[in-house]
Each structure stands twice: as structure tokens, then as C-alpha cells.
Interface confidence: low
């Protein structure tokens, strides 16, 4: 009685059970009662990553230089190409199918962490007594200078954005 | 809102260059894909290349073999696109038209176009 | 280089109705297909993206639709301003290529 279900790594065809073709390979043509599966590499710029009966192996994601990726792992016959952003960008998503520049936070705000090749620069609010005066992908908030410890009093008072302006005291008489 | 303005229109003679310029108002291009499309009277779209602003990479169409260069100068916010040995039939008119790296090729932002006109 | 195919190349419509308007690529693009508005005298202006994103701004009445090497756009009730030439763009491979452009003009 022909089979309704097959082994692990086969696959149903013509009341028969065929050997899947490895990862690397592709289908030429199924097996028959007389002959194996027949199965052929995939070129040097394709890959196929599981035991198949594709005909057509998958070409290899190409790591578009105008999109800002390069080449973080070259495919094989088995593997897909991995892509990564180029310095100074990061994945706009998941698939990493483009790239886009780090944010830079603006004054007012620092660096809580810096981008990497997929995440983006986290920026946080300078707290009272921080400021940040520039718009930076890599500055921390910086803390306002200390008048008192250069024997010095505070003229004008800082925001998240200035640092304190500090002055000499007023000498009493 | 994001504009492009291009450059005047062009009266050219046979195996002349012309050199149209694409002017960002708004945005820096740092972040956008520059691509340039010309369209015939009464033909379709056709893509000439694109310029990443970012790195300065291109790629051309190789229908245009050579003839095409893009370039930009960033500080300017402008991008442009030189065509050599011109023929009557690159008579069109030119647009260039940018995108946000997302979605490199799609363009959200288009000039008004320029046109460009060879004859003897 | 990636043949898109538009049809039909003229489309007669009545205001209010529905548009349907196809692209085929010569192979298989997934769904790298962006659909454009062109008005004589204009730039054209991006509607859909992705095959089916709609650009921020765009009327819901337009709605892209497919995947590999079928794409179709559809203006759901047509008014007055949607009359014009659609191209749809594959942006899968280079050299980007455009469709011969459907026209959609008032019956």
C-alpha cells in the first residue's frame, strides 16, 4: 500500500517517499522507483539552509554599500549573507535591511548610551546641576562647575544647557 | 515641508555635457538617498543612478555607459548629475528625488524637474 | 535588467467608481514595488511603497496589493484629482526599473 506519511528528511511524491535534498543543495528531480533524489549544489552566490525539495536555491542578501551596510558574514551554501551598518550607523530594523546615521542629542540632553551597529544612541535629559551645551552622538551630561572649590562665587546660575558662571566675592570692608 | 529645486532649463548641442544641480531646502542630505530619473516626451520613467550623500557611493544605470557622474557637496546641500555625449534623444526632462534611508529607493521627495533640450 | 508591465495602458473611468490598475515584473521583486501619481506637467508623487505601505498624506482610498511578480493598485471611489498617469517602480534589483505607466482618465 503506497505510503501516506514519510520519515524525517523525506518527502511525499507520486505515492512515494524521496530523499529531501541537504542543506546547499537544490532539487533536480524527484526520485522515482527505480532512482534516487537527485540533488545539485547551489552556486557560489546562492544557499539553501534547510533539507529541501527547492528547485531554485535563494540568492545570498546583498550587503548594499549605498544603504550603508558591509558585509558582516560572507554566505555560504548553507548560510545567507549577514549584514551590518557601516561606523557611524545602525540597522533600521531587525532584518537590517538599511541603515541610518546615529542620532545626536541635542543641547539640553546627553549620551545615556552610545549607538552601536543596531541600536540607536539613547539620549536622556540633563538633570539639575548637568548640562550639555552641544549636540553630540557620544557626550554625557557634564556636571556644572563647583565656584566654591575655586574659592569663587556663583554669578549666574546654570541650566541643562549652560554651566554656571562663576565670579569673585565680594570683598566686605 | 522638504523641497528640491533644481536647476534652469538647457538648450544643448550633440556631444556637449550638461550639468544639473538639486538643491535641498529644509534638510541636510546626510541620511537620504539621491536618485536621478529622467523621463522622454511621452515615455516612461527611466532611473539614471543613485548617490548615497552618507558615504558617497553611486551606481548607475549602465544603459548610460560611462556618461553619467553624480556628485554632491554636502555643505551645500546640493547634489548634481552630469551627463556627457549628449544625443537627441536625452531631450527630457530630469528629476532628481531623495528618500529616507528606510525606504532607500521609493522617493518621497521629488524636484520640479529640469529640461533638458539637444539639438543641432 | 527587471521588465515591469502595466495594464491596461488606458483606463476609462467614471467618477465614484472603483479603479483597479495592474504591474507585472518580468521576476520575482517580493514586494519591492513603489506605485506613483504623475499629472502632465508635474513630478510625480510617491503613493505606496513596500507594495502596500501608503506614504503618510495619501488618502486611504489607495491601496496597493501583491507579492513576487503580480501587483495591483486600487483607488477604491475615484474623484476628480485621481485622474492622471500611475507608474509602479520595482526597486528588488538594479538598474531600478519603471512601468510603461497605466493612464487613468474620466469616462
Known amino acids: 500500500e503506497p505510503p501516506t506519511a514519510c520519515r524525517e528528511k523525506q518527502y511525499l511524491i507520486n505515492s512515494q517517499c524521496c530523499s529531501l535534498c541537504q542543506p546547499g543543495q537544490k532539487l533536480v528531480s524527484d526520485c522515482t522507483e527505480f532512482t534516487e533524489t537527485e540533488c545539485l549544489p547551489c552556486s557560489e552566490s546562492e544557499f539553501l539552509d534547510t533539507w529541501n525539495r527547492e528547485t531554485r536555491c535563494h540568492q545570498h542578501k546583498y550587503c548594499d554599500p549605498n544603504l550603508g551596510l558591509r558585509v558582516q558574514q560572507k554566505g555560504t551554501s548553507e548560510t545567507d549573507t549577514i549584514c551590518t551598518c557601516e561606523e557611524g550607523l545602525h540597522c533600521m530594523s531587525e532584518s537590517c535591511e538599511s541603515c541610518v546615521p546615529h542620532r545626536s542629542c541635542l543641547p539640553g540632553f546627553g549620551v545615556k548610551q552610545i549607538a552601536t551597529g543596531v541600536s540607536d544612541t539613547i539620549c536622556e535629559p540633563c538633570p539639575v546641576g548637568f548640562f550639555s551645551n552641544v549636540s553630540s552622538a557620544f557626550e554625557k551630561c557634564r556636571p556644572w562647575t563647583s565656584c566654591e572649590t575655586k574659592d569663587l562665587v556663583v554669578q549666574q546660575a546654570g541650566t541643562n544647557k549652560t554651566d554656571v558662571v562663576c565670579g569673585p566675592q565680594d570683598r566686605q570692608r | 515641508q522638504v523641497q528640491l529645486v533644481q536647476s534652469g532649463a538647457e538648450v544643448k548641442k550633440p556631444g556637449a555635457s550638461v550639468k544639473v544641480s538639486c538643491k535641498a531646502s529644509?534638510?541636510?542630505?546626510?541620511?537620504?538617498?539621491v536618485n536621478w530619473v529622467r523621463q522622454a516626451p511621452g515615455q516612461r520613467l527611466e532611473w539614471m543612478g543613485l548617490?548615497?550623500?552618507?558615504?558617497?557611493?553611486?551606481t548607475y544605470n549602465q544603459k548610460f555607459k560611462g556618461r553619467v557622474t553624480l556628485t554632491i557637496d554636502k555643505s551645500a546641500s546640493t547634489a548634481y548629475m552630469e551627463l556627457s555625449s549628449l544625443r537627441s534623444e536625452d531631450t527630457a526632462v530630469y528629476y532628481c528625488?531623495?528618500?529616507?534611508?528606510?525606504?532607500?529607493?521609493?522617493?518621497?521627495?521629488w524636484g520640479q524637474g529640469t529640461l533638458v533640450t539637444v539639438s543641432s | 535588467e527587471i521588465v515591469m508591465t502595466q495594464s491596461p495602458a488606458t483606463l476609462s473611468v467614471s467618477p465614484g467608481e472603483r479603479a483597479t490598475l495592474s504591474c507585472k515584473a518580468s521576476q520575482n521583486v517580493h514586494t519591492r514595488v513603489a506605485w506613483y501619481q504623475q499629472k502632465p506637467g508635474q513630478a510625480p508623487r510617491l503613493l505606496i511603497y513596500?507594495?502596500?505601505d501608503r506614504r503618510t498624506g495619501i488618502p486611504a482610498r489607495f491601496s496597493g496589493s501583491g507579492s513576487g511578480t503580480e501587483f495591483t493598485l486600487t483607488i477604491s471611489s475615484l474623484q476628480s484629482e485621481d485622474f492622471a498617469v500611475y507608474y509602479c517602480?520595482?526597486?528588488?534589483?538594479?538598474?531600478?526599473?519603471f512601468g510603461q505607466g497605466t493612464k487613468v482618465e474620466i469616462k
Open positions: 517602480l520595482q526597486h528588488w534589483n538594479y538598474p531600478l526599473t
Open positions: 528625488a531623495s528618500s529616507y534611508y528606510s525606504n532607500p529607493y521609493a522617493n518621497d521627495y
Open positions: 548617490i548615497n550623500p552618507y558615504n558617497g557611493r553611486t
Open positions: 529644509v534638510y541636510s542630505f546626510t541620511g537620504y538617498t
Open positions: 513596500l507594495a502596500s
